[in-house]
């Protein structure tokens, strides 16, 4: 007798509850600062319900206001490493379509080895989100240290 | 004429809006790295609507995808203290049932005195979440500095 | 055939989906540690759906439990700057009505130049949220570096 059951005539997807939580697959090749993500129950606790992955980048399928969140931890990193390799910066943005390209969220590591943040932002069907990590330190692929997700909040 | 009123035949609980925000009660005894939480209106702004506390640990009552968030601030801490006592690490994970034990979220303090993060994760009825703080520094019990919560997002 | 359409007899506002995401407008005059916010599509990606701005401070229009989140980045900042100017602290709280005045969320910058956090908290219609930045460093007004928002979660 959960909400979904009370609204049996509507599939969950039609409720607008698009949500995704991704884990890091790999970093980009030279000159490509993007992180490449993966998701799905076979991989552990990551999933995509609505949004899709397009060559490792997250593509939105439903217009609305979304909560976007991210945590990235640098591997083999201490505060000394982080400051020596500064600036290491993470930016989350809309990278396509080009007409909507914009940076949504930006953080520098300074003397820390983890950044974590979240924000509300309007996204449209077809928007692709990219996460750019600039610097010389590698991100950890441990699923409890590095992850990226979105949650549809309202139209 | 809020949503809950429009769906008067359904109590709020059946909508799946389980949510909890907890404040720190105390740390564990020696050899127990867990933080022990408390919640309820009598304590201030903490609350449990759906999930329950089991000996200071948060137990989930409804299957679904949850947004888990936490902030922990170290007491009597400066960046010098934090780096001298490094590594101080916080990990949030499912600690029971043992068959589902997994680390969900992990952060180190490095030269900072506060960590804060959030993530989406599937949780099942009966999952108990533990927050392990390893290191020699004590967390602040101020309710605006240290808190832990979950929010049901979708089935 | 989104949820809003399936519930055509109910306007979105009545669903309780109050949400706001704000960008920094300016800092306060001397002796006023408050940050002054602005929001609206004309300004970029900020918006107010339900809550309102009252002289740059966010006023709540609907009772409920809210997810409050914030990120503040200090301008012209390095880890050395941050530690030299310590303590620089950000606090989010209810500042009016005076009878409900309380600090909800507090973080210090220590050796970092960005703080980001989030928490669940009950808010009532008429509560005004203030964000106080104490210290001598100025916040960045870049919309991807400094923002503040709330999301209604449940009654």
């Amino acid at each position: 007798q959960r909400f979904a059951q009370a609204q049996q005539q509507l599939p969950l997807e039609s409720l607008g509850w698009d949500v995704a939580e991704l884990q890091l697959n790999h970093t980009g090749p030279q000159q490509d600062p993007r992180l490449y993500w993966q998701g799905g129950p076979a991989l552990g606790r990551s999933f995509l319900h609505g949004p899709e992955l397009d060559k490792g980048q997250l593509r939105i399928h439903r217009d609305g206001i979304y909560m976007v969140h991210i945590q990235v931890t640098l591997a083999i990193c201490s505060s000394t490493t982080a400051s020596r390799h500064h600036p290491t910066t993470l930016a989350v943005g809309i990278c396509s379509p080009a007409s909507r390209s914009i940076s949504l969220l930006r953080l520098s590591f300074h003397q820390g080895c983890t950044i974590a943040s979240q924000r509300l932002t309007p996204l449209a069907r077809g928007d692709t989100l990219c996460t750019n990590l600039t610097g010389t330190l590698l991100p950890s692929r441990n699923t409890d240290e590095t992850f990226f997700g979105v949650q549809w909040v309202r139209p | 004429q809020r949503f809950a009123q429009a769906q008067q035949q359904l109590p709020l609980e059946s909508l799946g809006w389980d949510v909890a925000e907890l404040q720190l009660n105390h740390t564990g005894p020696q050899q127990d790295p867990r933080l022990y939480w408390q919640g309820g209106p009598a304590l201030g702004r903490s609350f449990l609507h759906g999930p329950e506390l089991d000996k200071g640990q948060l137990r989930i009552h409804r299957d679904g995808i949850y947004m888990v968030h936490i902030q922990v601030t170290l007491a009597i801490c400066s960046s010098t203290t934090a780096s001298r006592h490094h590594p101080t690490t916080l990990a949030v994970g499912i600690c029971s049932p043992a068959s589902r034990s997994i680390s969900l979220l992990r952060l180190s303090f490095h030269q900072g005195c506060t960590i804060a993060s959030q993530r989406l994760t599937p949780l099942a009825r009966g999952d108990t979440l533990c927050t392990n703080l390893t290191g020699t520094l004590l967390p602040s019990r101020n309710t605006d500095e240290t808190f832990f919560g979950v929010q049901w997002v979708r089935p | 055939q989104r949820f809003a359409q399936a519930q055509q007899q109910l306007p979105l506002e009545s669903l309780g989906w109050d949400v706001a995401e704000l960008q920094l407008n300016h800092t306060g005059p001397q002796q006023d540690p408050r940050l002054y916010w602005q929001g609206g599509p004309a300004l970029g990606r900020s918006f107010l759906h339900g809550p309102e701005l009252d002289k740059g401070q966010l006023r709540i229009h609907r009772d409920g439990i809210y997810m409050v989140h914030i990120q503040v980045t200090l301008a012209i900042c390095s880890s050395t700057t941050a530690s030299r100017h310590h303590p620089t602290t950000l606090a989010v709280g209810i500042c009016s009505p005076a009878s409900r005045s309380i600090s909800l969320l507090r973080l210090s910058f220590h050796q970092g130049c960005t703080i980001a956090s989030q928490r669940l908290t009950p808010l009532a219609r008429g509560d005004t949220l203030c964000t106080n930045l104490t210290g001598t460093l100025l916040p960045s007004r870049n919309t991807d570096e400094t923002f503040f928002g709330v999301q209604w979660v449940r009654p």
Epitope: Q30, Q31 | P87, T89 | -
Partner: antibody, heavy 120, light 107 residues
């Protein structure tokens, strides 16, 4: 079976250049970060450089920064180390090593090594 | 940089002996400590990772312990094939650094 096979070592004059290669097989090369580690004759191990799985992120020991360049070609399952401005102290056996996938950054597999001699 | 100090630099032991090698980090490295075995003319081989986890295929007579700054590699009953040089390595921060090595020789 995981195999790493280094090549390209040899004798070079001080100030000269050399390019080492490491051919990988038996695993999905493009999923792993890789490093070069060297060992001077009769001495201990010294980490030289690391490269991320897709090659976009690199890091170096201070002793080789600005002189050595690590790179990879995932289509050829090959890791490279371009060594310029070689010095006498660069004389060593150079090993390529695979990093464990979990990013704990231990070396779970090593090549057999290739000797670089810098002498006039 | 994090300095790794191994002791002893060499030791003589007999087959069947219990052997202990210690490694100390110049700062706390949590459990990011790994142990390798190297035989003359060969590449190093991973024995222990994350301070105490035994690498697949490594005999159970090898064990590791410790956290923070002090770590130990123990060989419970030395076998003829164990005579080699052993290195510790920290994977806590770059630059990745190794200990100077401990040579285990036949008594």
């Amino acid at each position: 079976e995981v195999q790493l096979l280094e090549s390209g070592g040899g004798l070079v004059q001080p100030g000269g250049s050399l390019r080492l290669s490491c051919a990988a097989s038996g695993f999905t090369f493009s999923s792993y970060a890789m490093s070069w580690v060297r060992q001077a004759p009769g001495k201990g191990l010294e980490w030289v450089s690391v490269i991320s799985d897709s090659g976009g992120i690199t890091d170096y020991a201070d002793s080789v920064k600005g002189r050595f360049t690590i790179s990879r070609d995932n289509s050829k399952n090959t890791l490279y180390l371009q060594m310029n401005s070689l010095r006498a102290e660069d004389r060593a056996v150079y090993y390529c090593a695979r990093h464990d996938y979990s990013n704990r950054y231990y070396f779970d597999y090593w090549g057999q090594g290739t000797l670089v001699t810098v002498s006039s | 940089d994090i300095q790794m100090t191994q002791s002893p630099s060499s030791l003589s032991a007999s087959v069947g002996d219990r052997v202990t090698i210690t490694c100390r980090a110049s700062q706390s490295i949590s459990s990011y400590l790994n142990w390798y075995q190297q035989k003359p003319g060969k590449a190093p081989k991973l024995l222990i990772y994350a301070a105490s986890s035994l690498q697949s295929g490594v005999p159970s007579r090898f064990s590791g312990s410790g956290s923070g700054t002090d770590f130990t590699l123990t060989i419970s009953s030395l076998q003829p094939e164990d005579f080699a040089t052993y290195y510790c390595q920290q994977s806590y921060s770059t630059p990745l650094t190794f200990g100077g090595g401990t040579k285990v020789e036949i008594k």
